[in-house]
Interface confidence: low
């Protein structure tokens, strides 16, 4: 780690739209990118009548909003699509929804990694 931060080398991959996009549905994604840029993991999901539907998970490019976040937490209040990002290998394996100024239960990611998917 550099300056105490966790280097992201790989993230959990998931694509609900895998058939149309012609990718695997799940796997482990190696994160590539410029050496001078930070890499992150992300998760995005929807809450359909209390049921969690994961949309995508994977690597995320250098984004200041993700710096030094070890946990993947969405803080926006009731977004249409939930999004979180984090730093650290497979840190998007679990994700939570904690809107600021409000207390709710965390949402855990039920997806289990499958064999690696490569682009």
């Amino acid at each position: 780690a550099i300056l105490g931060r966790s280097e992201t080398q790989e993230c959990l991959f998931f694509n609900a739209n895998w058939e149309k996009d012609r990718t695997n549905q799940t796997g482990v994604e190696p994160c590539y990118g410029d050496k001078d840029k930070r890499r992150h993991c992300f998760a995005t999901w929807k809450n359909i009548s209390g049921s969690i539907e994961i949309v995508k998970q994977g690597c995320w490019l250098d984004d200041i909003n993700c710096y030094d976040r070890t946990d993947c937490v969405e803080k926006k209040d009731s977004p249409e699509v939930y999004f979180c990002c984090c730093e650290g290998n497979m840190c998007n394996e679990k994700f939570s929804y904690f809107p600021e100024m409000e207390v709710t239960q965390p949402t855990s990611n039920p997806v289990t990694p499958k064999p690696p998917y490569y682009n």
Epitope: N17, K20, D21, R22, T23, E29, P30, C31, Y32, G33, T44, K56, G58, C59, W60, L61, D63, E80, V81, F83, Y118, N119
Partner: antibody, heavy 120, light 107 residues
Framework: EVQLLESGGGLVQPGGSLRLSCAAS????????MHWVRQAPGKGLEWVSN????????GYADSVKGRFTISRDNSKNTLYLQMNSLRAEDTAVYYC?????????????WGQGTLVTVSS | DIQMTQSPSSLSASVGDRVTITCRAS??????VNWYQQKPGKAPKLVIY???SRASGVPSRFSGSGSGTDFTLTISSLQPEDFATYYC?????????FGGGTKVEIK
Amino acid sequence: EVQLLESGGGLVQPGGSLRLSCAASGFTFDDSSMHWVRQAPGKGLEWVSNINYNGGYTGYADSVKGRFTISRDNSKNTLYLQMNSLRAEDTAVYYCAKSANWHDTALDYWGQGTLVTVSS
Amino acid sequence: DIQMTQSPSSLSASVGDRVTITCRASQSILSYVNWYQQKPGKAPKLVIYAATSRASGVPSRFSGSGSGTDFTLTISSLQPEDFATYYCQQSYELPLTFGGGTKVEIK
């Protein structure tokens, strides 16, 4: 320095075929997803096709599906686009472009383009 | 397919002006938006990726914002070399789709 150099364009009659090539250098080609994007004269950009690092996954725009085939030869650092059953509306400058990272987030390098003209 | 609606299609501005170009997606695409600059007879050049991140070598006067369906490219102080056509592009899913372009012309 990343370089992408397209070739193979030219004048072809409707119904004819062309094979475009894109020679890549300056980056690890066999790690990179690649794309073809075209631009008709005076018009905007239209994505045509993509291929993953080893050719295992390909994608096509509906307008070219069944007529165009994308492929790559990693030993030659070259991307190809085989275009069959060409139509007048396929007339465009064809660019090859490289994905910025594994996740297909953006196209960070583009070639200079090669012009394909379909006309009788 | 996801439609990307860009506006305006053209604008006239002077050197030093603040220029804003908008792009609207037909569905939520998170931050999967990129912006390109294209000059006549040249290939497009990546300016902004992932909605807000400047590509390597791009001046700080270029910035991007937005998430979900509405996105903006802003040039804080237009320079002579910025007169060009700008395109937004979604990379949320295949097929990748582009906006119709915004031509930034000299007033």
